[in-house]
């Protein structure tokens, strides 16, 4: 009769490498008497005998995983016990190896120039795959703008037009290589005006061609606005070459106007717009008009009706063919530009513009316009509209095309007379006199001369000169 013998594992478990969907086997050879009972664990959890993913044979000495999954990674142990001595255990690891697999491939992207683009490429695999990218037929090189992230995604900072093209990601490890499908990166560019229309001073009845050139991706469309409305007459010719659109507006000039070229292109649901404007003025064509620069008349327009004094006489400049229409058109265009400014700036700017374009008028042998007081002009520009003014001047200094407030017919404050010097020489903006916290609308803002309660200082101590060279802008 055999003597009882405690179990001894004669072939300890080893690390097993297996590919996904392949078979993996652990062998646990045991010598003992009587025959031992062998159980198996994975990560210290007992493997049930009836689990169909496993096959346990040779009295429990062979554990086979029939189709390896990546979740089967772990430590496997066999435990042998026959009641003689203690139970014995041997453990080994299963390392699931996996060919590269792209789990989140890149997709087609449309991106606006200057923004950041990220093309995803999430991978699986063991060993962890390295990810590289191909653009067109060539390997993509990383630089200060272009980087492959830890996740495998491709990040492009400050996207440029030349970044457009076809991309694919490549995942590679020691077991193989996976390629994504080709995806397209399209770079869109905001509409930008390359050549602004030029202003013209022409004689009545002349033909003028205004030219506006714009670029963008997609190619922009160009529309023309005359004094705030769609151009009512004239012919437009357009040509497109290399994403540049060239538009020429030919006009027969019978009145002065402000012509705005608007270039627009679409980016998804949004539009980008660039504007440039030019004035067409009519040269004075008779000596009598040269001698008389304007006349006084009641304001009969609509735009400044709430701002100007009721029944006030205002100055109309006869350097325009039809002064009342021309000045009304200019203020109408200015009004549209003011839609973009802040609520603090807008009413102050409206008061300034109306009183500047329609100056209070002293009738007489020579009708004389009365300019705004420099103090009010400064307050509007540098206090109420400070942000708008700085933004505008900053763009001008950098040579960028200016939009918005630069189109407004604004006076140059330093050329205006001071209200402190001669209260009757300039016009106040009573908008600024109002106690604003008590007022929500300004239905009857009227202009007025400074009242005589401001003393005229003696000439020896206060000799500010009133600028005679003031003229309409």
């Amino acid at each position: 009769e055999k003597l009882p013998k405690a179990p001894v594992i004669t072939t300890p478990l080893e690390t097993v490498d297996a590919l996904v969907e392949e078979v993996a086997t652990f062998m646990c050879a045991v010598e003992s008497y009587p025959q031992p009972e062998i159980s198996w664990t994975r990560n210290k959890i007992l493997i049930k005998l009836f689990d169909t993913r496993y096959s346990i044979r040779e009295n429990g000495q062979l554990l086979t995983i029939l189709s390896v999954e990546d979740s089967d990674d772990g430590i496997y142990c066999c435990i042998a016990n026959n009641g003689v001595g203690g139970a014995v255990e041997s453990c080994g690891a299963l390392q699931v190896k996996m060919k590269p697999k792209i789990t989140r491939p890149p997709i087609n992207v449309k991106i606006i120039e200057g923004l950041k683009a990220v093309l995803p490429c999430t991978t699986m695999g063991n060993p962890k795959p390295s990810v590289s990218w191909i653009k067109g037929d060539n390997a993509l090189r990383e630089n200060s703008r272009i980087a492959v992230l830890e996740s495998g995604s491709l990040r492009i900072h400050n996207v440029q037009k030349e970044d457009a093209g076809q991309y694919r990601c490549v995942a590679k490890n020691s077991l193989g290589t996976a390629y994504s499908k080709l995806v397209k990166l399209e770079v869109e560019v905001f509409a930008r005006i390359l050549r602004a229309p030029e202003s013209h001073n022409v004689t009545f009845g002349s033909f003028v061609t205004l030219r506006c050139t714009a670029i963008g991706i997609p190619v922009p469309t160009i529309s023309w606005i005359e004094n705030g409305n769609a151009v009512s007459s004239g012919s437009i010719q357009e040509s497109v070459k290399d994403r540049v659109i060239d538009s020429r507006l030919q006009l027969f000039i019978t009145k002065p106007g402000l012509y705005t070229c608007i270039a627009t292109n679409k980016h998804g649901e949004k539009f980008s717009t660039a504007k440039a404007a030019a004035t067409v003025s009519i040269a004075e064509w008779s000596k009598s008009q040269k001698d008389s620069q304007g006349y006084c008349a009641q304001y009969r327009g609509e735009v400044c009706d709430a701002v100007l004094a009721k029944d006030a006489l205002v100055f109309f400049n006869t350097s325009y063919r039809d002064p009342e229409d021309a000045q009304e058109l200019l203020i109408h265009t200015a009004w549209n530009e003011l839609k973009a400014v802040s609520p603090l700036c807008r009413p102050a700017a409206e008061a300034l513009l109306c009183n500047h374009l329609f100056q209070e008028c002293s009738p007489g042998v020579v009708p004389t316009p009365m300019p705004i007081c420099r103090e009010y002009c400064l307050a509007v520009k540098e206090l109420f509209c400070a942000k708008e003014w700085q933004a505008m001047e900053g763009k001008a200094h950098r040579g960028l095309y200016r939009s918005g407030m630069h189109l407004l017919p604004v006076p140059e404050c330093s050329k205006l007379p001071s209200m402190h010097r001669d209260p009757t020489a300039c016009t106040r903006l009573p908008y600024l006199d109002y106690k604003k916290e008590n007022i929500t609308t300004f239905p009857s803002i009227t202009s007025s001369r400074p009242s005589a309660d401001i003393p005229n200082l003696p000439a020896s101590t206060s000799s500010f000169a009133v600028s005679p060279a003031y003229s309409m802008t």
């Epitope: 520009k381 206090l383 309660d453 206060s462």
Partner: antibody
């Protein structure tokens, strides 16, 4: 950016005159008026007068009439304030300031004038 | 000349308090009043222009109101950095005139 740089501190004897200068930069010098304001030690602000650098016209507070003179030099973008017949109560910090009430205000760093026998 | 009278000339308050400073003009100056803050050894800084408009960059706890001859500067919730001297300035006519100042101290 706009800067107003004033001349250095001065110590004067009673009866003497002092001239404080204020050099402007970062803007069109002739487009803005310049004020002079002073502050005696531990006291409040006192408006002295104003100059239009374009042409040099001035307006002074009554208190300083006859003793103060403000001038401008467009070639160097500098305004100056001269105060004569100094007395001990003229000891103060003198500031130049651009457009106090109506436009964007900018101040010089101040010049201490000490009047002492 | 227009006289500007500020009250109080000095006051003490605690952080979080609501503070009101008044400025009276000897004649109508419309809205043409500015408020300045000055800290020891520093140049004055404008807080409010044309009576009720907050200078760009100034915290919204400062507000101004009034027209004609009566004006107020209000600090809705006093902060440690608000302890300073405050001046009003009329710029309706020459000569411009400052109020005598209000020194705001920590209680």
């Amino acid at each position: 950016q706009v800067q107003l740089v004033q001349s250095g501190a001065e110590v004067k004897k009673p009866g003497a005159s002092v001239k404080v200068s204020c050099k402007a930069s970062g803007y069109t010098f002739t487009s803005y008026y310049m004020h002079w304001v002073r502050q005696a030690p531990g006291q409040g602000l006192e408006w002295m007068g104003i100059i239009n650098p374009s042409g040099g016209s001035t307006s002074y507070a009554q208190k300083f009439q006859g003793r103060v003179s403000m001038t401008s030099d467009t070639s160097t973008s500098t305004v100056s304030m001269e105060l004569s017949s100094l007395r001990s109560e003229d000891t103060a910090i003198y500031y130049c300031a651009r457009e106090l009430g109506w436009g964007s205000d900018y101040w010089g760093q101040g010049t201490l004038v000490t009047v002492s026998s | 000349d227009i006289q500007m009278t500020q009250s109080p000339s000095a006051m003490s308050a605690s952080v979080g308090d609501r503070v009101t400073i008044t400025c009276r003009a000897s004649q109508d100056i419309r809205n043409y009043l500015a408020w300045f803050q000055q800290k020891p050894g520093k140049v004055p800084k404008r807080l409010i222009y044309i009576a009720s408009n907050l200078q760009s960059g100034v915290p919204s706890r400062f507000s101004g109101s009034g027209s004609g001859t009566e004006f107020t500067l209000t600090i809705s919730s006093l902060q440690p950095e608000d302890f300073a001297t405050y001046y009003c300035l009329q710029h309706n006519s020459y000569p411009y005139t400052f109020g005598q100042g209000t020194k705001l101290e920590i209680k």
